[in-house]
């Protein structure tokens, strides 16, 4: 090798300057005696280069970039040989930001793969490898005193959140949990949020049913639906409260909202609704009075309301 | 303290009926399903049925259905099991025990023997 | 309905002992399994719930392990007063299941 590059930084925030030396050894004995040693960033010659002899005989060249404005690039120094540029050294140059602070953590709890899955928001491109780690610990009391620390959650490539295994949980007892984001030029740690993993769980939504017509039962009066619900059966224990959503199928009308209903109350007549009409249901459930997520929304279930009854049979149908 | 204090078993023949009370204080009663678990002579532990908080919803072991019923009375903090048309296999040391948010029993109560023989 | 098959039934150990007893289900149940010590005359107290958390005043020498169909007791230094029977039980939905038992007695 007859040249080296040495800079200030290969890791710059962008816009900011960089100092590169390119020293060509004497022993390259086939090179002219004064040779004019050039520099490249990328593609384009930069001109600027300050060069002078050592006393131990090397050259040396040293360039300043007042501002290095390209998040990725190869910065060269180089010789003329004959007509054509010989490379004799060169770098990767790499400008960005430091991270910013990871924001709007959340985590949510998830009794069936029995994990602590928490989302955060990165914040802007940093242009720069950049690592999250979110970080744990559990606590007697609301994390002010750090009990023992949890194994550090690492998320894949691109990704902005994270799972905690229930093995590194213990329900109704606090963690402290944010997320510390780290690349060449810095450090930064999202506020922290002190949880119980059990007050941020999130329910399956119960599966509704239309109810089986009992012959002793009467039929739902018009504009009247009748259904049921079977809870989730893992999150049975909890005490709930629910709501439903109806819409008709035809036309634009927006989900009307009924509720809050008792998990428990496992049936349930919707009335006040056009007679023989078609409507999309579907339930969600939260864990109540204590703290929860609410569950996503329940598949739909589709049901017609019965016809109005003929005037002339004198039903009287009170709403 | 949470403390629960069954009561009401004793000896009582084949066909015949019993009716457990267990009898809660120390906590909010009325916000958490409740359960029985037996134990017969030198056996393990079989669960025999729940009840919700406000009691919508009974399931029972299949040894059991049809012929024990569980109740709970939220204002008097008292679960109840009322137990009909009893046989020599219901003989047990009958618990009472609260359930916790994942299905969890405690605390339990301390027992209370139940004989069923002629 | 799941079964719960626990092992051993009965096991010899001397105080200081590690011990570990296992628990199987016939089919995945996350983590719903929870472990109970119980004592001759006495009531089933509370171990471990849903797997592995160890309940408030339960000596740290208990632990619990695993998930699906697989889950281990142990008590890694046995003392005097563990000398019992344990039970696993499942609570994942009904009917809700107990295993056979595994009596713990002195060598």
């Known amino acids: 090798e007859c040249g080296h590059i040495s800079v200030s930084a290969p890791i710059v925030h962008l816009g900011d300057p960089i100092t590169a030396s390119c020293i060509i050894k004497q022993n390259c004995s086939h090179l002219d005696p004064e040779p004019q040693i050039l520099w490249r960033l990328g593609a384009e010659l930069q001109p600027g280069g300050r060069q002078q002899r050592l006393s131990d005989g090397t050259q040396e060249s040293i360039i300043t970039l007042p501002h290095l404005n390209h998040t990725q690039a190869f910065l060269s120094c180089a010789l003329n040989w004959g007509n054509s540029l010989q490379i004799l050294d060169q770098v990767e140059l790499r400008a960005g930001y430091p991270p910013a602070i990871p924001h709007n953590l959340s985590c949510l709890m998830n009794l069936t793969t029995s994990s602590l899955i928490c989302q955060w928001e990165p914040g802007p491109e940093t242009h720069l490898p950049t690592s999250f780690t979110l970080k744990s610990f559990k606590s007697r009391g609301n994390c002010q005193t750090q009990g023992d620390s949890i194994l550090d959650c690492v998320p894949k490539d691109g990704q902005s959140h994270c799972s905690i295994p229930r093995k590194h949980l213990l329900l109704y007892q606090n963690m402290g949990i944010w997320v510390q984001a780290e690349n060449a030029l810095g450090t930064s740690m999202s506020p922290q949020l002190c949880l119980d993993p059990m007050d941020v769980v999130k329910l399956e939504p119960p599966m509704l049913r239309t109810m089986d017509p009992s012959p002793e039962a009467a039929p739902p009066q018009a504009g009247c639906l009748q259904l049921s619900w079977e809870p989730w059966q893992p999150g049975l224990h909890i005490n709930q409260k629910c709501e439903l959503r109806h819409k008709p199928q035809r036309g634009e009308a927006s989900w009307a909202l009924v509720g809050p209903l008792p998990l428990e109350a496992l049936q349930y007549e919707l009335c006040g609704l056009l007679p023989a009409t078609a409507y999309t249901l579907q339930i969600r459930c939260i864990r109540w009075p204590l703290p929860g997520h609410w569950s996503d929304w329940s598949p739909s279930l589709e049901l017609r309301t019965t016809e109005r009854a003929p005037t002339h049979h004198h039903h009287h149908h009170h709403h | 303290e949470v403390q629960l204090l069954e009561s009401g078993g004793g000896l009582v023949q084949p066909g015949g009926s019993l009716r457990l009370s267990c009898a809660a204080s120390g906590f909010t009663f009325s916000l958490y399903w409740m359960g029985w678990v037996r134990q017969a002579p030198g056996k393990g532990l079989e669960w025999v049925s729940s009840i919700s908080s406000s009691g919508g919803v009974t399931p029972y072991a299949d040894s059991v259905k049809g012929r024990f019923t569980i109740s709970r009375d939220n204002s008097k903090n008292t679960l109840y099991l009322q137990m009909n048309s009893l046989r020599a296999e219901d003989t047990a040391v009958y618990y009472c025990?609260?359930?916790?948010?994942?299905?969890?029993?405690?605390?339990w109560g301390q027992g209370t023997l139940v004989t069923v023989s002629s | 309905d799941i079964q719960m098959t626990q092992s051993p039934s009965s096991l010899s150990a001397s105080v200081g002992d590690r011990v570990t007893i296992t628990c199987r289900a016939s089919?995945?149940?996350?983590?719903?399994l929870n472990w109970y010590q119980q004592k001759p005359g006495k009531a089933p107290k509370l171990l471990i719930y849903y797997a592995s958390n160890l309940q408030n005043g339960v000596p740290s020498r208990f632990s619990g392990s695993g998930s699906g169909t697989d889950f281990t007791l142990t008590i890694s230094s046995l003392q005097p007063e563990d000398f019992a029977t344990y039970y696993c039980h499942f609570s994942m939905q009904y009917p809700l299941t107990f295993g056979g038992g595994t009596k713990v007695e002195i060598k």
């Open positions: 089919q995945g149940i996350s983590s719903y």
């Open positions: 025990a609260k359930l916790g948010e994942l299905g969890w029993f405690d605390p």
